[in-house]
């Protein structure tokens, strides 16, 4: 049979997902119901590995599968009739498959830094990079991330900095390739904690009796993490700035003369039965010298006529010595200190003085 050469196909339309493309086209020849079509699909920069698809007669659409996400392809479509008589020129169209979304990403806190490390494995296929969005309340930040390669299963990471401590962030990462954006991958991550900001003021100390005082102080600001505990520290010495080293000293050490500074009382804030919001400042009043015991710390009676100053340590993380039961490990804790109060001088023991006078 004799056939005239088919005219070229036109109006090629492509719809894609990550690994497939559905192509449709038109041919306006009267004889087009007798045509089949030959499709050549070639990945950009890889002409040696073209895929060929031949349609059934009269079919003007085809789906090509097993494509690579986020990649650029060119399709050529020839109309053909009879014994391989083809249109002179193919219809041509370039297209991109959709990029693959990141399966998931993990967050890690950075110790004592207001930052998060995000870690992920590269999604399959090609990508030009990623859009990163970080949001918390009214604050947000959008930035680009570099492209990655999925070939060797490498773990990729980026550090998100300039965040706030102990704050929950909504994070979204969107894969980009060929000007297309995948569905975003989301996670909610919370930044870590650090030493609390030291308070401006110092505690208020007042004499109650010849062997006890009352220490009043305001709760520390919780912007670096929730305050987990307070330690009330007394000294009879020169009131320099306290360090974490003093947290190991107890009333017993003080009585033995091993230290002029010691922890007399410990408050676990969880015991107060309510959580402290960032702006809420709680007031504390501690009776020092009432012979109570908190964990490894004995709140022993004070010395009549003694001169005492008080300071408060606030903890966002309190760690105890594994071998020294009930004593704080200052080096492992997240702690800061108030300034020392003014000194208070205790009165003499009137009863003892009276007794002494009678003898």
């Amino acid at each position: 049979a004799q056939y005239t050469r088919p005219s070229n196909v036109s109006n090629i339309d492509v719809s894609t997902n990550t690994t497939a493309a559905t192509l449709s086209w038109q041919n306006f020849d009267d004889a087009s119901p007798t045509y089949s079509y030959c499709l050549l699909i070639e990945k950009a920069g890889n002409s040696s590995n073209a895929t060929q698809v031949v349609t059934d007669i009269g079919i003007t659409d085809a789906t090509v599968t097993e494509l690579i996400p986020g990649s650029s392809y060119t399709v050529e479509i020839f109309a053909q009739v009879g014994d391989g008589i083809k249109s002179l020129e193919p219809g041509r169209k370039s297209f991109c498959t959709d990029p693959a979304s990141m399966a998931s990403f993990d967050c890690e806190v950075v110790p004592k830094e207001p930052a998060l490390v995000l870690k992920w494995t590269c999604p399959p296929g090609a990508n030009a990079g990623f859009e990163l969005e970080v949001s918390s309340g009214a604050w947000n930040n959008a930035t680009h991330l570099e492209s990655c390669s999925s070939e060797n299963g490498t773990e990729y990471r980026t550090e998100v900095t300039y965040l706030n401590f102990s704050t929950s962030y909504n994070i979204s990462i969107t894969t980009v390739s060929c000007g297309k954006m995948a569905a975003p991958t989301r996670n909610t991550c919370t930044t870590g904690i650090t030493d609390p900001p030291p308070p401006d003021g110092s505690p208020n100390i007042t004499s109650v009796s010849h062997n006890s005082v009352k220490v009043k102080f305001s709760g520390f600001e919780a912007s670096h993490g929730p305050i987990k505990a307070y330690a009330v520290i007394l000294t009879t010495g020169e009131a320099g700035h306290p360090s974490a080293d003093v947290l190991k000293y107890t009333y017993e050490d003080f009585k033995k003369g091993a230290s002029d500074t010691y922890v007399t009382y410990l408050i676990r804030t969880e015991e107060k039965g309510r959580s402290q919001s960032l702006s809420e400042v709680l007031k504390y009043e501690i009776d020092v010298g009432n012979e109570s015991t908190t964990l490894g710390y004995y709140n022993g009676k004070l010395e009549p006529l003694g001169s005492y100053r008080a300071c408060v340590a606030g903890f966002t993380n309190i760690t105890f010595h594994p071998q020294n039961k009930g004593l704080i490990d200052g080096a492992e804790s997240y702690v800061s200190f108030s300034r020392y109060s003014d000194a208070v001088s205790l009165p003499q023991d009137v009863a003892a003085a009276h007794h002494h006078h009678h003898h």
């Epitope: 030009a128 859009e131 680009h144 969107t174």
Partner: antibody, heavy 117, light 107 residues
Framework: EVKLVESGGGLVQPGGSLKLSCAAS????????MAWVRQAPTKGLEWVAY????????YYRDSVKGRFTISRDNAKSTLYLQMDSLRSEDTATYYC??????????WGQGTLVTVSS | DIQLTQSPASLSASLGETVSIECLAS??????LAWYQQKPGKSPQLLIS???PLHDGVPSRFSGSGSGTQYSLKIRNMQPEDEGVYYC?????????FGAGTKLELK
């Protein structure tokens, strides 16, 4: 095929308001960062505003901050630009665009906003 | 704001000629640079993003290169349909900014 169609432009007096819309089709609108770009008559291009996909974070050029509001309705695949306290220097053709990795990939045909008394 | 200085402001080229347009950024933009073509009365069209990947359907006679603060667009084998205004644009830092444009005409 990606299609972006802007509407809502027109003549408005200084101090007046206008709301532009951009109807998107041919792609998954909710996945995309979107932006408005404008072009004053016979002038160059100027980025105006930007909105992200996940949390709808917004960014504006300084000259429109506090006067313009970009928003999106993913269910309707539509991008908006509410323009208040309009000034003569806002006169321009306004284009909406997809904006992955900081590049304006697909553009609408534009809608003309004229601010004049 | 990051300034983009485009040069030349205008040029004319003969059919088949190769032309180059330069774009200089006031600071490092880490290859977040795009090139656009705009024809009279039409919307801009993306040619190149991220300094060198060619956008879908853009003829291969267009190419982009550069890094840091210096970028260029090259058009080989100038064709009549290449006439128009070309803009560079940085997408590294807000506010995103455009160059002033280069008008390309056929000689």
């Amino acid at each position: 095929e990606v299609k972006l169609v802007e509407s809502g432009g027109g003549l408005v007096q200084p101090g007046g308001s206008l709301k532009l819309s951009c109807a998107a089709s041919g792609f998954t609108f909710s996945n995309y960062y979107m932006a408005w770009v404008r072009q004053a008559p016979t002038k160059g291009l100027e980025w105006v505003a930007y909105i992200t996909n996940s949390f709808g974070s917004t960014y504006y050029r300084d000259s429109v901050k506090g006067r313009f509001t970009i928003s999106r309705d993913n269910a309707k695949s539509t991008l908006y630009l509410q323009m208040d306290s309009l000034r003569s220097e806002d006169t321009a053709t306004y284009y909406c665009s997809t904006v992955p990795l900081g590049a304006f990939v697909y553009w609408g045909q534009g809608t003309l906003v004229t601010v004049s008394s | 704001d990051i300034q983009l200085t485009q040069s030349p402001a205008s040029l004319s080229a003969s059919l088949g000629e190769t032309v180059s347009i330069e774009c200089l950024a006031s600071e490092d933009i880490y290859s977040y640079l795009a090139w656009y073509q705009q024809k009279p009365g039409k919307s801009p069209q993306l040619l190149i993003s991220h300094a060198n990947p060619l956008h879908d359907g853009v003829p291969s006679r267009f190419s982009g290169s550069g890094s840091g603060t210096q970028y260029s667009l090259k058009i080989r084998n100038m064709q009549p349909e290449d006439e128009g205004v070309y803009y560079c644009q940085q997408g590294y830092k807000f506010p995103y900014t455009f160059g002033a444009g280069t008008k390309l005409e056929l000689k």
